[in-house]
């Protein structure tokens, strides 16, 4: 039995994957920031996790996926205010009782040190210094990502 949040995540990813190719993104769009091979958009407004997921999808992007601790630190360095939280693309899968990225992969427990509980309706946010488990209904900012690729590429769930 999938939760409504899991269904929403799967639906949005599937709809994005129907297109198998798109032109490579050579430069970050206006208002997006480049971080290595990604373009990041730090929202100014606030939304619950579901709405944040949907918003990134409409921008042909996804909620932020963090590969490792190094990428986390570099992303946190772009956050100017230590009091602000941002949703990323990680939430608790009740059916699998584990943290799950929106591309379907599970969190490597060594990657992020999460403060808070791993339970139903929990989603992950990051601040300048920490990673938090929050109720997914909490209205905070969010980070969208687009992959920078100079060639035509296949669109995978985590692109």
């Amino acid at each position: 039995q999938k939760s409504s949040i899991e269904k929403c995540s799967v639906d949005i990813q599937q709809s994005r994957n129907k297109t198998t190719e798109r032109p490579g993104l050579l430069n970050c769009p206006i208002y997006w920031q480049q971080l290595r091979e990604k373009c990041l958009l730090f929202s100014h407004t606030v939304n619950p996790w579901n709405n944040s997921l949907a918003d990134c999808s409409t921008k042909e992007s996804s909620l932020l996926l963090i590969r490792d601790k190094d990428e986390l630190i570099h992303t946190q360095n772009l956050i100017r205010d230590k009091a602000i939280l941002f949703w990323i693309g990680l939430n608790f899968s009740l059916s699998e009782k584990n943290w799950k990225w929106i591309n379907g992969s599970f969190l490597n427990s060594n990657d992020l040190e999460i403060r808070g509980d791993a339970k139903e309706n929990s989603c992950i946010s990051i601040s300048q210094t920490s990673v938090y488990s929050e109720y997914c209904s909490t209205e905070i900012r969010w980070i969208c990502q687009k992959e920078l690729t100079p060639v035509r590429n296949k669109v995978y769930p985590d692109s």
């Epitope: 208002y31 100014h44 407004t45 709405n51 949907a54 918003d55």
Partner: antibody, heavy 117, light 110 residues
């Protein structure tokens, strides 16, 4: 070049509903937020509200009970409906691109809406 | 009554510098680095001059600069030119996805 164009009736009767549409060209409506702002003659600007392409909306608390915004991605248009209008709603209405929800980088030329019987 | 307070008028001679203030509260100007400034000539739509306190969109001359201290934001126009004569409005994010404007300042080039 990003361009926005407001359209709709220039005259609305008191107690009726004001309806305006903004047509966007030169920019996909899907990648940004879109706002309405108004300006009574000789006065300052007032933010009315915004719509996200996901369909969610944020409204000015003072107008919220009378406001409805919608969006048609296939036509690259978004719309405003303000119900139960009075003379105080007479203003030039602008549509604007609202890229991050905190500022407006492209504006329509504005359309004057007069509320009068 | 506007949420943000601006002086009704400001003036300067060509070549001079003029600063327009915009005072809010800790719930808007003081609470976020999301202040923007707009220029409006008579009968025209507003034009974005500054966003996120001090960033200039492409095409806006570097004579226009923005800053913020506490609950007050400022727009400075240096090397005043005749075409700078216009109304100027400040705006700020005000939390819970709300945006507020100032009452406007009429800038006159003497």
């Amino acid at each position: 070049q990003v361009q926005l164009q407001e359209s709709g009736p220039g005259l609305v009767k008191p107690s009726e509903t004001l309806s305006l549409t903004c047509t966007v060209s030169g920019s996909s409506i899907s990648f940004y937020y879109w706002s309405w702002i108004r300006q009574p003659a000789g006065k300052g600007l007032e933010w009315i509200g915004r719509i996200y392409t996901s369909g969610s909306t944020n409204y000015n608390p003072s107008l919220k009970s009378r406001l409805t915004m919608s969006l048609d991605t296939s036509k690259n248009q978004f719309s405003l409906r303000l119900s139960s209008v009075t003379a105080a709603d007479t203003a030039v209405y602008y549509c604007a691109r609202d890229p991050l929800g905190t500022f407006f980088d492209y504006w329509g030329q504005g359309t004057l809406v007069t509320v009068s019987s | 009554q506007s949420a943000l307070t601006q002086p009704p008028s400001a003036s300067g001679s060509p070549g001079q510098s003029v600063t327009i203030s915009c005072t809010g509260t800790s719930s808007d100007v003081g609470g976020y680095n999301y202040v923007s400034w707009y220029q409006q000539h008579p009968g025209k739509a507003p034009k974005l001059m500054i966003y996120e306190v001090s960033k200039r969109p492409s095409g806006v001359p570097d004579r226009f600069s923005g800053s913020k201290s506490g609950n007050t934001a400022s727009l400075t126009v240096s090397g005043l030119q005749a075409e700078d004569e216009a109304d100027y409005y400040c705006s700020s994010y005000a939390g819970i996805n709300n945006v507020v404007f100032g009452g406007g300042t009429k800038l006159t080039v003497l």
